[in-house]
Interface confidence: medium
């Protein structure tokens, strides 16, 4: 019963992580550049995402623009987009596998097959988590590196956006969920009759001597 609770917990965390990856992918806040001038007319914040960028004025007014082409996206965000999309697809596969291998579903009759499917689902979630943590951490690394780079103009220094924090949370949930599912050990394959058979054999052997 404790094993089933662990399984439900693992699936729930992984599904939450999967949803968080989607949010991280959609939010246009991977990189944030604040141009806070001495004047409200020229104070604006630029949000850069995987699909669009937005300008937010000091008056709260916001305008977003979808990137015209893939080439309009900086290289690191191009790579991030690819990895995050793959992560979403991989995590979706993990969700499917966890439903098939769930203790409370009847997609598979064999308990051993169910347990193995669940371990595969766990590994898939772990992979999805790694696929999110890599681009998120790489983007954060670049931002931090530029922030402390004296050659980068202060007006061009970016800050970490909310999407990065959502991405880290998503990867944490996927890794935790996947880890719990991987702990889901398959049942022992020893059958009752085999135990009786080995006991009979040992008795026969002692009688022979």
């Amino acid at each position: 019963m404790a094993s089933m609770g662990l399984q439900v917990m693992g699936i729930a965390l992984a599904v939450l992580g999967w949803l968080a990856v989607m949010l991280c992918c959609a939010l246009p806040m991977w990189r944030v550049t604040a141009f806070i001038g001495s004047n409200i007319v020229t104070s604006q914040t630029i949000w850069e995402g995987l699909w669009m960028n937005c300008v937010v004025q000091s008056t709260g007014q916001m305008q977003c623009k979808v990137y015209d082409s893939l080439l309009a996206l900086p290289q690191d965000l191009q790579a991030a987009r690819a990895l995050v999309i793959i992560s979403i697809i991989v995590a979706a596969l993990g969700v499917l596998l966890s439903v098939v291998g769930g203790k409370c579903t009847n997609c598979l009759e064999d308990e051993s097959a169910k347990a193995k499917t669940m371990i595969v689902a766990g590994v898939v979630f772990l992979l999805a988590g790694l696929m999110v943590i890599v681009p998120v951490s790489w983007t954060a690394h670049n931002i931090i590196q530029d922030f402390y780079n004296p050659l980068v103009a202060s007006g061009q220094k970016r800050e970490m956006g909310a999407s990065l924090y959502v991405g880290w949370a998503a990867s944490g949930l996927l890794l935790l969920g996947g880890g719990l599912l991987c702990c889901n050990c398959p049942p022992r394959t020893d059958k009752p009759y085999s135990a009786k058979y080995s006991a009979a054999r040992s008795a026969a052997a002692s009688n022979y001597v």
Partner: antibody
Framework: EVQLVESGGGLAQPKGSLKLSCAAS????????VSWVRQAPGKGLDLVAD??????????FYADSVKDRFTISRDDSQSMVYLQMDNLKTDDTALYYC??????????WGQGVMVTVSS | DIVLTQSPALAVSLGQRATISCRAS??????????MHWYQQKPGQQPKLLIY???NLASGIPARFSGSGSGTDFTLTINPVQADDIATYYC?????????FGEGTKLELK
Amino acid sequence: EVQLVESGGGLAQPKGSLKLSCAASGFDFDSYGVSWVRQAPGKGLDLVADISSKSYNYATFYADSVKDRFTISRDDSQSMVYLQMDNLKTDDTALYYCTVIAGGYLDYWGQGVMVTVSS
Amino acid sequence: DIVLTQSPALAVSLGQRATISCRASQSVSISGFNLMHWYQQKPGQQPKLLIYRASNLASGIPARFSGSGSGTDFTLTINPVQADDIATYYCQQSRESPPTFGEGTKLELK
């Protein structure tokens, strides 16, 4: 309908003072920044001063040419903006417009008030 | 300060296309957003916003007005020109403090 009505202009002596007022109506005044833009006779436009909304702590900006001489303020309860002009110079002679800052640009303009500095 | 350069005057015939240019002393674009705006001022009237962020038409402005450009070079196009469009046109940047205006381009009839 958005309306900005300026008042308080007129003739002033050099080193004298004037206080311009701008009465706003027809929009959510306390959410927007407001600026004063001037236009010398036959010349172009110059942003003189601006003031942000309460959410941005009423931050103010002054053009270098008026720093320490002009003071911008606002009264959200009355939907009013003021420009206190002290130590006036002949160069300050211009038509002064009250404008609403929408987002990097000046969305609405008043009719303007004339300020003449002459001895 | 960013200096905006406009030609002082432009003569056009009614029904023709008018192209008014504005050149900035440095780029006024950030991450694909062009922080240049256009105003129209008719004689004896206050200025009126026409175009914001280079290409967005302000509310109530007819579609014969359009804006384009990026970086340092921007254009306001009026096509076709009508008698009511005779005015002075100003560009303004909000990329850097202080915000600055161009000297204005006076649109005249040929």
